[in-house]
């Protein structure tokens, strides 16, 4: 009686269980019932990543540096090639098929966390006490400088874009 | 110990000004903030700005801007707000309180004066 | 400028009862360079100044009783009565001090069931 389900890494064919080709191979006949099935490695920029019954094998992905992309992990012929992203730049989606130039936080924020490949700056507000007098992708908020353990006074209060401005202590009005 | 008093009350006529002190003892004034807040009557809590005594920087409430003018004396250890122009709903509690001593973490008021209240009646 | 709500606006309770105050803030108080949420809470009762109660969310002030407790994070702060007292009879303000304005919460009475 022919089969109606077959084993893993089998599919069933012509009423009869033939094996699936491995990864990095694909399909070139099915097996009969003398013959196994025959498979044939996939070729240079090819892939297929499952046992299968595919006759093409898959291209790998192509890392468009005019998209800011690079190579992060070349591919095999049982793995696609994963791109990332320049320097600088990171991922407009979890497939990364392009990028944007990382955010900078503007002059009264810092960097919370800077960017990664797959992830962009996140920013946070300077709060009082701290500040950032630049547009960046890196730095944080810098405390404000202590003129008391300089022996200084506060001449002009600090901002959240702006650092205290110290002077002698005679200055004091 | 810290103490903040406040000059008494006032009644004033709208359009007028009115200037209410705040005496600081127990403390190195110049160093430390003097914070400004409001409540008008049954009404919360306003923040209307603040001084640094020691370099006369300021800060204020956008709100309060033309409104609250504050100043301060070294000399004396007395800070100063000034508010012009009084209108019926100027009528509040005015508070002074300490704020940050100059550490850059103490930005929360941890003494206050008593409270000057300014009636602005016709 | 940062709003901050607190909810609820009045509560009945007796003595001896957990009060249970909420804050939140429209966006997060928290700095991620010191790990500190900067928030206070006051109590103020009739005709009298406000009285700091809590700083940095949840450091109690000195000389406050330990029945006052502060806790949360980022955007969501509850202040803690463990069990009320006669004298804890008031309105109580949250205020936020991260970026100029400083803002309080339009308070909480707390009243005599």
């Known amino acids: 009686e022919p089969p109606t389900a077959c084993r893993e890494k089998q599919y069933l064919i012509n009423s009869q269980c033939c094996s699936l080709c491995q990864p990095g191979q694909k399909l070139v006949s099915d097996c009969t019932e003398f013959t196994e099935t025959e498979c044939l490695p996939c070729g240079e920029s090819e892939f297929l990543d499952t046992w299968n019954r595919e006759t093409h094998c898959h291209q790998h992905k192509y890392c468009d540096p005019n998209l800011g992309l690079r190579v992060q992990q070349k591919g095999t012929s049982e793995t696609d090639t994963i791109c990332t992203c320049e320097e600088g730049w990171h991922c407009t989606s979890e497939a990364c098929e392009s990028c944007v130039l990382h955010r900078s936080c503007s002059p009264g924020f810092g960097v919370k966390q800077i960017a990664t490949g797959v992830s962009d700056t996140i920013c946070e507000p300077c709060p009082v006490g701290f500040f950032s007098n630049v547009s960046s992708a890196f730095e944080k908020c810098h405390p404000w400088t202590s003129c008391e353990t300089k022996d200084l006074v506060v001449q002009q209060a600090g901002t959240n874009k702006t650092d205290v401005v110290c002077g002698p202590q005679d200055r004091l009005r | 110990q810290v103490q903040l008093v406040q000059s008494g009350a006032e009644v004033k006529k709208p359009g007028s000004s009115v200037k209410v002190s705040c005496k600081a003892t127990g403390y190195t004034f110049s160093t430390s903030w003097i914070e400004w807040i409001r409540q008008a009557p049954g009404q919360g809590l306003e923040w209307i700005g603040s001084?640094?005594?020691?370099?006369?920087?300021?800060n204020y409430n956008e709100k309060f801007k033309g409104k609250a003018t504050f100043t301060a004396d070294t000399s004396t250890s007395t800070a100063y707000m000034e508010l012009s122009s009084l209108r019926s709903e100027d009528t509040a509690v005015y508070y002074c309180?300490?704020?940050?001593?100059?550490?850059?973490?103490?930005?929360?008021?941890?003494?206050w004066g008593q409270g000057t209240l300014v009636t602005v009646s016709s | 400028d940062i709003q901050m709500t607190q909810s609820p606006s009045s509560v009945s309770a007796s003595v001896g009862d957990r009060v249970t105050i909420t804050c939140r803030s429209s966006?997060?108080?928290?700095?991620?360079?010191?790990?500190?949420?900067?928030l206070a809470w006051y109590q103020q009762k009739p005709g009298k100044a406000p009285k700091l109660l809590i700083y940095?969310?949840?450091s109690l002030q000195s000389g406050v009783p330990s029945r006052f407790s502060g806790s949360g994070s980022g955007t969501d702060f509850t202040l803690t009565i463990s069990s009320l007292q006669p004298e804890d009879f008031a309105t109580y303000y949250c205020q936020h001090y991260y970026s100029y304005p400083w803002t309080f919460g339009q308070g909480t009475k707390v009243e005599i069931k």
């Open positions: 309180a300490r704020g940050d001593d100059g550490s850059y973490v103490r930005w929360y008021f941890d003494h």
């Open positions: 940095w969310a949840s």
């Open positions: 966006q997060s108080l928290l700095f991620s360079v010191n790990q500190k949420n900067y």
């Open positions: 001084i640094l005594p020691g370099s006369g920087s300021t």
